[in-house]
Amino acid sequence: KLLQVSTIAMQQQEKLIQQERALLNFTEWKRSCALQMKYCQAFMQNSLSSAHNSSPCPNNWIQNRESCYYVSEIWSIWHTSQENCLKEGSTLLQIESKEEMDFITGSLRKIKGSYDYWVGLSQDGHSGRWLWQDGSSPSPGLLPAERSQSANQVCGYVKSNSLLSSNCSTWKYFICEKYALRSSV
């Protein structure tokens, strides 16, 4: 009788673990879908506004290769910074290479001083992995230098020529990025 009860208990526990896994997968899938939708909206908005504009980047944006960057002069927490970018048909900056990082830090040196700027990097709560907003992982050379001691959600920011991490609810400037228009020659 006791053996039967413990077998049932183990089966129930196994079922619970499977359900938790399924829920976790669903949550990740939902997050991924929501992000893809935001990116589609941003892309469409960008394409539509581009149709009325012949220069590769909008006013007050800086161009480097295929990208346009906007260095904000307003402060927001990370999530609001992302929202501000999305409404412009862009996203928080995603740094793909050392060359791009050098361009950004060089531009910041010229524009301002040593301030903090949110980028589109955040730490996954479950795995602790760093992820860009499109769900990809940063290359090993582009991981935040210091691990934040915060118990809250942690996000990435650029300061001088470093990529650092901080509580996502702190106030910082931010950098938006979108595709530059290809001029039809």
């Epitope: 906007y70 904000s72 927001s76 999530h79 929202e83 501000n84 970018c85 409404k87 412009e88």
Partner: nanobody, 120 residues
């Protein structure tokens, strides 16, 4: 259409406080940020602070950070700008606006503006 009505401006001494109100009516604000801009004589209009109506996400300009606080009352469709430690350079006409973008410095709908004068 969105109608915006500002109130709360006036004359105040340096170091004093004012609370501006912006009452919105008409169509839904869910796709907009309600923003406060200001324009001093002979200067360009500049963003002071903004709140995305749907998410409640707030942004502040450098000039406002640490001295001004933006809040809203959903039930009253009203946004408030609490301005403390006012300086003579805060003297301007303050406009409430509904904007679909915070970064562009432009807005879809504007209020009439309310004068804030800070004397030294």
């Amino acid at each position: 259409q969105v109608q915006l009505q500002e109130s709360g401006g006036g004359l105040v001494q340096a170091g004093g406080s004012l609370r501006l109100s912006c009452a919105a009516s008409g169509r839904t604000l869910s796709n907009y940020a309600v923003a406060w801009f200001r324009q001093a004589p002979g200067k360009q209009r500049e963003l002071v602070a903004a709140i995305w109506w749907a998410s409640g996400g707030i942004s502040y300009a450098n000039s406002a950070k640490g001295r001004f606080v933006l809040s809203r009352d959903n039930a009253k469709n009203t946004v408030y700008l609490q301005m403390d430690s006012l300086k003579p350079e805060d003297t301007a006409v303050y406009y409430c606006a509904a904007a679909s973008s915070v970064l562009s410095g432009t807005a879809d709908y504007w209020g009439q503006g309310t004068q804030v004068t800070v004397s030294s």
